[in-house]
């Protein structure tokens, strides 16, 4: 058993049929010594008396809010949550496996630049009695500070018969050094509590590996005289790190016809313009990627050829 | 050229070669052995490699103030990785795949280090650690880890040379 926060405790249980469970001793936070009784949740049934209560925790019915009283007055509470371990593996019932970029990916994180600011998100089908708390650091043995805000519900989607809820959190490294080569990864830890079930999820990454620039901005076409060619131009997204002579992007320009089967003309360039042939009913799209490190491409910015 | 005395490097040449190194480091990564190994094991395995750190003056302001500190750090790293690529981690069993561009990567590391420090000039170089794994699978895992950290190292070096070529070239 360990303390998650004041008056909230997590009991770690090996979860299998007829498991013996864990013996837990609760102590009432009071100077009083006599006349103390214990109850669980809203029940008035007295579970025991005395300053301490010893219980055998085996299942969710044994978890909940234990309260010690004296003469009708509440002295203190202890909330017991359960953390299940099945076949040596901690349960992951609360969050959905996003399966990207690999199986068992529950947390996904992205950064728009090298400032040390990043966003993580996760999915669940649970709509009520759900709380999250997020902690983060750079490195684990001698951790350096990363400050995370509160997790918020950022999107709701209908997936077949189910509703899916997306939560996200923003974090900022306290003393970020955008130009340095990271040697210790960022660690993100999410505590999830659903009713009386506790689970924790972690992710470890370098900012450089989660970079995904915003799409190029101000995408424009300029037809070239007496030609089917057009000059496409664009700018770096506002959110990208500066100076651009140091934090450079590379771009992919694509001409795509209406039909998905048509050959896509693709040009890679480090410049912020390119000359392409504009076909009828086609569209021109541009996306960006860090020029020197192959993290994610941005989403496409597009304009119609006509 | 970035000689220890403090004259400027051939920024544009360094920019081109370091950008080439970035592509080679990425293209070499999946091709260093037959096993499909993901990043496994503790982070300590490649903690001995040189990193370009916050105080090394490789940020835009640091380069403007005095690029020598940063260039020396980059030079140390290039020599370090060049030695690793020539070691039995890469030359031993299991053999590299035939398609692997590790030979080009090796030559380019040497080429860039020579651009930074021509024959006859010497900066202190970092001691190469004795990373000699006994098992072939350990060697394979170490190759992946070395190439992953090399990708990060050359990315920073390429940014330095791109910025230098754009703002510090005569």
């Amino acid at each position: 058993i360990w303390e998650l926060k004041k008056d909230v405790y997590v009991v770690e249980l090996d979860w299998y049929p007829d498991a013996p469970g864990e013996m837990v001793v609760l102590t009432c936070d009071t100077p009083e010594e006599d006349g103390i009784t214990w109850t669980l949740d809203q029940s008035s049934e007295v579970l025991g008396s005395g300053k301490t209560l010893t219980i055998q925790v085996k299942e969710f019915g044994d978890a909940g809010q234990y309260t010690c009283h004296k003469g009708g007055e509440v002295l203190s509470h202890s909330l017991l949550l359960l953390h299940k371990k099945e076949d040596g593996i901690w349960s992951t019932d609360i969050l959905k496996d996003q399966k990207e970029p690999k199986n068992k990916t529950f947390l996904r994180c992205e950064a728009k630049n090298y400032s040390g600011r990043f966003t993580c998100w996760w999915l669940t089908t649970i709509s009520t009695d759900l709380t999250f708390s997020v902690k983060s650091s750079r490195g684990s043995s001698d951790p350096q500070g990363v400050t995370c805000g509160a997790a918020t519900l950022s999107a709701e989607r209908v997936r077949g018969d189910n509703k899916e809820y997306e939560y996200s959190v923003e974090c900022q490294e306290d003393s970020a050094c955008p130009a340095a080569e990271e040697s210790l990864p960022i660690e993100v830890m999410v505590d999830a509590v659903h009713k009386l079930k506790y689970e924790n999820y972690t992710s470890s990454f370098f900012i450089r590996d989660i970079i995904k620039p915003d799409p190029p901005k101000n995408l424009q076409l300029k037809p070239l005289k007496n030609s089917r060619q057009v000059e496409v131009s664009w700018e770096y997204p506002d959110t990208w790190s500066t100076p651009h002579s140091y934090f450079s992007l590379t771009f992919c320009v694509q001409v795509q016809g209406k039909s998905k089967r048509e050959k896509k003309d693709r040009v890679f360039t480090d410049k912020t313009s390119a000359t392409v042939i504009c076909r009828k009913n086609a569209s021109i799209s541009v996306r960006a990627q860090d020029r020197y490190y192959s993290s994610s491409w941005s989403e496409w910015a597009s304009v119609p050829c006509s | 050229r970035a000689v220890p005395g403090g004259s400027s490097p051939a920024w544009t040449q360094c920019q081109q070669l370091s950008q080439k190194l970035c592509t080679l480091a990425w293209s070499a990564h999946p091709l260093v052995g037959h096993m499909d190994l993901r990043e496994e094991g503790d982070e300590e395995t490649t903690n001995d490699v040189p990193h370009i750190q916050c105080g090394d003056g490789c940020d835009p302001q640091g380069l403007r103030d005095n690029s020598q500190f940063c260039l020396q750090r980059i030079h140390q790293g290039l020599i370090f990785y060049e030695k690793l690529l020539g070691s039995d981690i890469f030359t031993g069993e299991p053999s590299l795949l035939p398609d692997s561009p590790v030979g080009q990567l090796h030559a380019s590391l040497l080429g860039l280090s020579q651009l930074l420090q021509p024959e006859g000039h010497h900066w202190e170089t970092q001691q190469i650690p004795s990373l000699s794994p006994s098992q072939p699978w350990q060697r394979l895992l170490l190759r992946f880890k070395i190439l992953r950290s090399l990708q990060a190292f050359v990315a920073v070096a390429a940014r330095v040379f791109a910025h230098g070529a754009a703002t510090l070239s005569p």
């Epitope: 693709r266 | 080679l24 990425w26 030359t91 795949l97 035939p98 398609d99 030979g103 080009q104 090796h106």
Partner: antibody
Amino acid sequence: HVQLQQSGPELVRPGASVELSCKASGYIFITYWMTWMKQRPGQGLEWIGQIFPASGSADYNEMFEGKATLTVDTSSNTAYMQLSSLTSEDSAVYFCARGGGGFAYWGQGTLVTVSA
Amino acid sequence: DIQMTQSPASLSASVGETVTITCRTSENIYSYLAWYQQKQGKSPQLLVYNAKTLAEGVPSRFSGSGSGTQFSLKINRLQPEDFGRYFCQHHYGIPFTFGSGTKLEIK
């Protein structure tokens, strides 16, 4: 299994251009360099250049700079080489091969004949 | 560019004999050397890479050795299908260069 299928023979006039193709199958196209080589009848092999499909980054032998242009179409897993301003010196068999080191997989070759 | 000097230019040998072809480079290429066999009208076939690693499916009578600037390809107990042209190629820095070839003929 890995296959590189090259386009058919070409008979072209001096001064014209020609585009050769090399369609790859049996592997992840964007992960490997694609290299092009030239071989004149009874002669050795010359390395023309290479392209990395994931980024479109290409390198050329100085002798073929301005003569050859390498491109890829990642949606069809095809590499292309355009040869321009052709002369009789460009008559040869052109091979594509996978990789940026030793070449374990080669196309069958495309014969280009430049003749008036 | 790295120069590749391959010798001999041609070689006659009988089935069952052992032959050695050598390749010298103008500068150190470590072990980044490959050997190919080419039959008339066909694409080259990789025999050895990284100086001494046998490519997949290549019979064990072929072996490569050397490092730095001196390399050799040895063929033990020549078989009828071994006759053809042999090339060395370095795969160190670009441009890659090939040796001028050794023509191996039946005596």
